[in-house]
């Protein structure tokens, strides 16, 4: 059998605080424990959940936890169930509420000498004890003609008089704690001799030089006094007006009239009513001078047909707030339809081309009127005037591709070459009308071109193929001066291109035919063994049917290429001594010698006293210093070729002779001794 070791028991609990209903069972088999509340299973929540077999409450809730709890243990296998004793909470709580008028039914019915009952809507368990306050001061039973029962939630004032006027609040306490009224009640019972407001002045906004009227009336028994004051507490009467209120009139009924209002009249006006008894009643109203600022400019707008667009008109700052309306062609726009005004917005629903034009936003108040125009363009999809056409452009000349379109607004035209956007540079130029100019057409310009003409409404495009008409030209042009090495084989190439493959042939400039050892093989001039007589002027002629012929003149020089007779050697010199770097070259034409030392050419005219280049090409350096060390290059060149050779120069300190070294001892390295 299932036995309860611990059973839940009824207990006191505090609203919002923790609680625990204990339950522990002993059984032969596995049992499930669950809880019932008023016979219904309790579902676990974050607030209320099973903890082992017990039921834990993180925060007791007087509404959700009222009722009878029971712990049930069940053996699933047999189906046997055991139920604990019932347990419930005595939940202690207190909850704030307002002070309300119980009698009479409404505030309007409160009259002097009537009975007034207020009710304190603070509830709790156990039943709270109440305390009443007027203007924060506690009220006690039988005080100043009122009956108060601290056990009750009602406060009765009988009879109610002006002395009972004030702010009523209540507090209550019980075993849970204390709470005070969430909303208090202001009781106002008039004394006939107190000044009461009949008509209060309202803020006024007037235009400059217009008139302003403030109304003010009080009532009391006997009748009250009424006085007007301006900003600096200056009284305004018909007998004594301040200098800046010369045009002010106070009427018998209390109204104040200001005529021809100026900026200095703007400010706060006070109307003061004083009864025989009671405090003065002060009413304030402000006189504002109407004003209106300028309107911000509109940017021109471009819209597309069929779309819905809105243009917002920001009203200018002004007092009073300016009213705003839209006009088109001098007619005020309606508040509904296809083109209409909504608030400050101009709404164009399903825009048509005919909606284009100037729309005006107007703003107006007492101070005047302002207006601002907005130019609306209805964009159209471009149409063709002239499409780009497949074209043959001549190489080397300017070429044009047209893309002429029309639309509103003026379309923008961009060009693509092989799907790549053409950015304007020295070779490409797009004119305002959309025409593309290719300056100095090149062979590789022969491809597809596409132009796209666009407006916000859409775009059109067309493409054309460009074929480049190649000019007849040498590729590459032969060098006008060329050298051939004497007694060696030599070739002089000449090639050309054109619209048709050109024929190429060589001839001597004097018209004489080529010797038999010289052959012209498809444009390549071939010398089997160059002789002195082969030197001279030659002409390469390229020709085809449609383009005629072109000529390139070449002067061939026969030369003996440079060789070095003497080359500089690796040289080591003592500091302060003289270094000699020898160099001699031969060739035809006779070569010139130049020296380069430490990566700069040694200019014979700027060598200074220590260096000298001999006629035969040798370089001498006197009084060598360590900084003269480095690589020296001898460069030999003539009009046909150039050759160089180099050697290092080392500058070393002269060693101090040791005793063991005799006067005949050789130096440790090859030296030039001078």
């Amino acid at each position: 059998a299932i036995v309860f070791i611990k059973q839940p028991s009824s207990q006191d609990a505090l609203q919002g605080r923790r609680a625990l209903l204990r339950c522990e069972v002993e059984a032969p088999g596995l049992v499930h424990v669950y809880w019932l509340l008023d016979g219904a299973p309790v579902q676990d929540t974050e607030r209320r959940f099973t903890q082992g077999s017990s039921l834990s409450f993180a925060a007791v809730d007087r509404l959700q936890d009222s009722g009878t709890f029971q712990c049930v243990a069940r053996d699933d296998v047999t189906g046997e169930e055991a139920r604990s004793a019932n347990a419930s909470f005595n939940i202690k709580w207190i909850e704030a509420g307002p002070v309300v008028l119980k009698h009479p039914a409404s505030e309007a019915e409160i009259q002097p000498q009537t009975q007034v009952t207020l009710r304190c809507h603070i509830d709790g368990h156990p039943r709270p004890t109440y305390q009443w306050f007027r203007d924060g001061t506690p009220l006690s039973d039988g005080q100043s003609n009122n009956t108060v029962s601290s056990k009750e939630r009602n406060l009765t004032l009988r009879p109610a008089g002006p002395e009972h006027s004030g702010l009523y609040s209540c507090c209550a306490h019980n075993a849970f704690g204390q709470a005070c009224s969430s909303q208090n009640f202001t009781l106002s019972i008039a004394d006939e001799s107190f000044a009461r407001v009949v008509l209060a002045p309202q803020d006024v906004i007037v235009a400059r030089n217009e008139e302003a009227m403030f109304h003010c009336q009080f009532s009391a028994q006997p009748p009250p006094n009424l006085q007007w004051l301006f900003e600096d507490e200056t009284p305004i009467t018909n007998r004594s007006r301040p200098p800046h209120l010369r045009r002010a009139t106070v009427f018998a009924n209390g109204s104040l009239l200001l005529t021809q209002v100026r900026p200095r009249n703007a400010g706060v006006y006070r109307c003061i009513g004083q009864g025989q008894r009671g405090p003065p009643v002060i009413l304030e109203a402000t006189l504002h001078l109407a004003e209106i600022e300028d309107m911000p400019l509109f940017e021109p707008r471009v819209f597309t047909a069929g779309s819905e667009e809105r243009v917002t008109c920001l009203p200018p700052k002004g007092l009073p707030e300016p009213s705003v309306w839209w006009e088109h062609a001098g007619v005020r726009l309606p508040t509904h339809g296809r083109v209409y005004q909504k608030g400050h917005e101009l709404v164009l629903a399903s825009i048509a081309e005919s909606d284009a034009g100037v729309y005006t936003c107007h703003a107006a108040n007492l101070a005047g009127q302002r207006r601002q125009d907005v130019n609306i363009t209805v964009a159209t999809v471009p149409t063709w005037l002239k499409k780009p056409q497949d074209s043959q452009l001549e190489e080397g000349k300017p070429g044009y591709l047209h893309c002429l379109t029309q639309a509103t607004p003026k379309p923008t035209v961009v060009w693509y070459r092989n799907q790549m956007l053409i950015s304007e540079d020295s070779r490409f130029e797009v004119f305002k009308n959309g025409t593309l100019r290719i300056n100095n057409v090149e062979v590789y310009d022969g491809t597809w071109y596409r132009c796209v003409s666009s407006t916000p409404a859409g775009s059109i495009e067309a493409q054309a193929r460009v074929q480049v008409l190649e000019k007849l030209k040498f590729t590459p042009p032969p060098q006008p001066q060329q050298c051939m090495e004497f007694d060696k084989e030599a070739t002089v190439p000449c090639s050309a291109t054109g619209r048709e493959k050109p024929t190429i042939k060589w001839e001597r400039a004097d018209g004489s035919s080529l010797p038999e050892w010289v052959t012209d093989n498809a444009g390549t001039l071939h010398f089997a063994r160059v002789t002195r007589d082969d030197a001279g002027n030659y002409t390469c002629i390229a020709s085809n049917g449609p383009q005629g012929q072109i000529r390139a003149h070449v002067q061939l020089t026969v030369a003996v290429f440079i060789t070095f007779k003497v080359e500089p050697e690796r040289t080591t010199v003592y500091q302060g001594h003289t270094a000699l770097l020898q160099c001699e070259a031969q060739g035809d034409p006779k070569p010139l010698i130049q020296w380069k030392g430490k990566d700069r050419i040694l200019d014979p005219t700027k060598l200074g006293p220590r260096m000298h280049i001999f006629q035969n090409g040798s370089l001498v350096i006197h009084d060598v210093a360590p900084e003269d060390s480095g690589r020296y290059t001898c460069i030999a060149g003539n009009s046909c070729n150039i050759k160089h050779t180099e050697a290092p120069l080392y500058v070393v300190d002269k060693p101090v002779p040791e005793e063991s070294e005799g006067p005949g001892s050789p130096p440790p390295y090859k030296m030039i001794q001078t």
Epitope: L30, Y34, L36, G39, Q70, D75, G79, E81, R83
Partner: antibody, heavy 111, light 109 residues
Framework: VQLVQSGGGLVHPGGSLRLSCAGS????????MYWVRQAPGKTLEWVSA???????YYADSVKGRFTISRDNAKNSLYLQMNSLRAEDMAVYYC??????WGQGTLVTVSS | EIVLTQSPGTLSLSPGERATLSCRAS???????LAWYQQKPGQAPRLLIY???SRATGIPDRFSGSGSGTDFTLTISRLEPEDFAVYYC??????????FGQGTKLEIK
Amino acid sequence: VQLVQSGGGLVHPGGSLRLSCAGSGFTFSTYLMYWVRQAPGKTLEWVSAIGSGGDTYYADSVKGRFTISRDNAKNSLYLQMNSLRAEDMAVYYCARGLGYWGQGTLVTVSS
Amino acid sequence: EIVLTQSPGTLSLSPGERATLSCRASQSVSSSYLAWYQQKPGQAPRLLIYGASSRATGIPDRFSGSGSGTDFTLTISRLEPEDFAVYYCQQYGSSPMYTFGQGTKLEIK
């Protein structure tokens, strides 16, 4: 322990039927009792349960249409079935715990 | 809601052979709360195993249960002719809203 069922039969869609299950050989009032059904050729489906204190539980498929009750004085369990549908047709078993089952009663729902 | 999936749907074996039936849960089941039933045509289900591995009263020791978490097994060590039937696994929990597997039919090969 014995569980004897009665009350099955043929009913039209939308009709009502009350099944009964009489228990003997155990203290009926201290046991959880429940109903399980088995449609032809299908698996077993739990339908409803009632605790010893009268707390009730229902499968979503029958909630609002079926009512489980018990009379501890008569050692009897009941299943009141209203608004019957074609998919309610099955053999209904009453059971106590896991090991004790009634012989089953067939409920046929057909127009 | 926990869903129980039994495999295989049908198992064909001969008397004397060993039978292994599987039951997989869609989420973890406390092993204390898994049962196995045997049902023969026209009869009410009969409890074989409860608590995943405990044999019910009068059940021969050739029937054994094992497993934990989401994978459970019913093993019949040596099939007898009377063992050929439909077998169901069942999950029972803190609420008496029990769920059953779709069943495994054990038939003679």
